[in-house]
Amino acid sequence: GITNINCSGHIWVEPATIFKMGMNISIYCQAAIKNCQPRKLHFYKNGIKERFQITRINKTTARLWYKNFLEPHASMYCTAECPKHFQETLICGKDISSGYPPDIPDEVTCVIYEYSGNMTCTWNAGKLTYIDTKYVVHVKSLETEEEQQYLTSSYINISTDSLQGGKKYLVWVQAANALGMEESKQLQIHLDDIVIPSAAVISRAETINATVPKTIIYWDSQTTIEKVSCEMRYKATTNQTWNVKEFDTNFTYVQQSEFYLEPNIKYVFQVRCQETGKRYWQPWSSLFFHKTPETVPQVTSKAFQHDTWNSGLTVASISTGHLTSDNRGDIG
């Protein structure tokens, strides 16, 4: 990090050391060096000497002017050329920052992932501010009117144990930095309505070589929620568009879903669930690959990290979700 300079003078910025990106700014340097009437004053930005837009104001002070300053961060310092000194003399340095006031936070979303013990609140922060921006999440009980505030720089996890004011709350987010402050709309939540069931996972697949070959996908979740609605999407890996099947599910046993697929094609499957009738879905599960056989029955399990081809038996991995560009959480 930046170490302090023993200053032999003063450096300052107008309008301020943190300012709106695109502004015209002036940096002033005033020398106070014993036995030195500076012959010349130099400005450096990020360790590189500036050549232009420097004006000498008086014997000890100079001004560096920037038009339309667009740098998110710069370290400035200035030096003096003193008579009879072989080297320049350091005067002082300062960090400067430019950025934007925060946008109004929108798309405020709060969910409780089953078994997590937390309510997770997220929001769209808007455009990059470039400067340190803090967020205060306000949670107000509609029953007790008690309000709690949580400071963060991104999302927030709030322990459900700390939500003692009943089931209904108002949640809103305040964004603030050196250049401004904005507040989101209020989100009304009921704790029972925002629970997302424990993750559904595809464990294996098999293709049964009947008259019409049939692929069975085995999948499960550890959820204790009784009424769960799920979607399974699948497509050939060469395709862009997904096919979607919907299920009303009871997870007291492993689910088996049947698909009639084209032979000798590699397919990818994903599943997600929600509490029936509620608003929020799980993120899509990890990608699960299965190649249908030409004739031989095949089983796919998550035992290996890569496809193995061995005497007609295909064993393929579950690849992690970041392999797909369309693997967003779809919360909301």
Epitope: I2, N46, G47, P72, G93, S98
Partner: antibody, heavy 122, light 111 residues
């Protein structure tokens, strides 16, 4: 963990063009000035481009001036080097490097990527 | 441009002994009492790693057996005691002014 990953290297003919990329992670990219440094097959290191945090200031040595252009996309945390009118002497491993100030006045290349190779040959 | 001349081009040192690498700048790399001289280590297949900045300050995580000294135009990097892991190329670099320039490197090997 600070990570710089270069890509885009390859083989081109003299006079050709190529664009290198450097994906940054593990630090606030927009707060750092960045550079490209190349290493010739003879292992000589040569600084080839500098860019300030917002891209307003760029500097190059005479050997590449007018042929190379450094740029950055702070929203994507990515640094670029557009190279044109390539010559055989541009053949090198190209590294992107972060510049860090240990004081206001003293900047060093504190983190380097693993590099990407450019070969210019007919 | 400031030209950096490194010597020797290669060096073989026994385990536990001292390795000294020199670097001379074509003009002073000092200003306002600071020497703008840095040292890097590079192992095969790896990028350079910062060892020493401002002539004598150790980079983060750099073992104490690496030390730098000098001012003006003459600088040196000392490694003592020499360890097997220190086999590498070493480069000096001036950061006083653009264009920033490097020495041609010194190959350090075990004797």
């Amino acid at each position: 963990e600070v990570k710089l990953v270069e890509s885009g290297g390859g083989s081109v003919k003299p006079g050709g063009s190529l664009k290198l990329s450097c994906a940054a992670s593990g630090f606030t990219f927009s707060r750092y000035t960045m550079s490209w440094v190349r290493q010739t097959p003879e292992k000589r290191l040569e600084w080839v481009a500098y860019i300030s945090t917002g891209g307003g200031d760029t500097y190059y040595p005479d050997s590449v001036k007018g042929r190379f252009t450094i740029s950055r996309d702070n929203a994507r945390n990515t640094l670029y080097l557009q190279m044109s009118s390539l010559r055989s002497e541009d053949t090198a491993m190209y590294y992107c490097a972060r510049r860090t100030s240990y004081s206001y006045y003293n900047y060093v290349f504190d983190y380097w990527g693993q590099g990407t190779t450019l070969t210019v040959s007919s | 441009d400031i030209v950096m001349t490194q010597s020797p081009a290669s060096l073989a040192v026994s385990l536990g002994q001292r390795a000294t690498i020199s670097c001379r700048a074509s003009e002073s790399v000092d200003n306002y009492g600071i020497s703008f001289m840095n040292w890097f280590q590079q192992k095969p297949g790896q990028p350079p790693k910062l060892l020493i900045y401002a002539a004598s300050n150790q980079g983060s995580g750099v073992p104490a057996r690496f030390s730098g000294s000098g001012s003006g135009t003459d600088f040196s990097l000392n490694i003592h005691p020499m360890e097997e892991d220190d086999t590498a190329m070493y480069f000096c670099q001036q950061s006083k002014e653009v264009p920033w320039t490097f020495g041609a490197g010194t190959k350090l090997e075990l004797k």
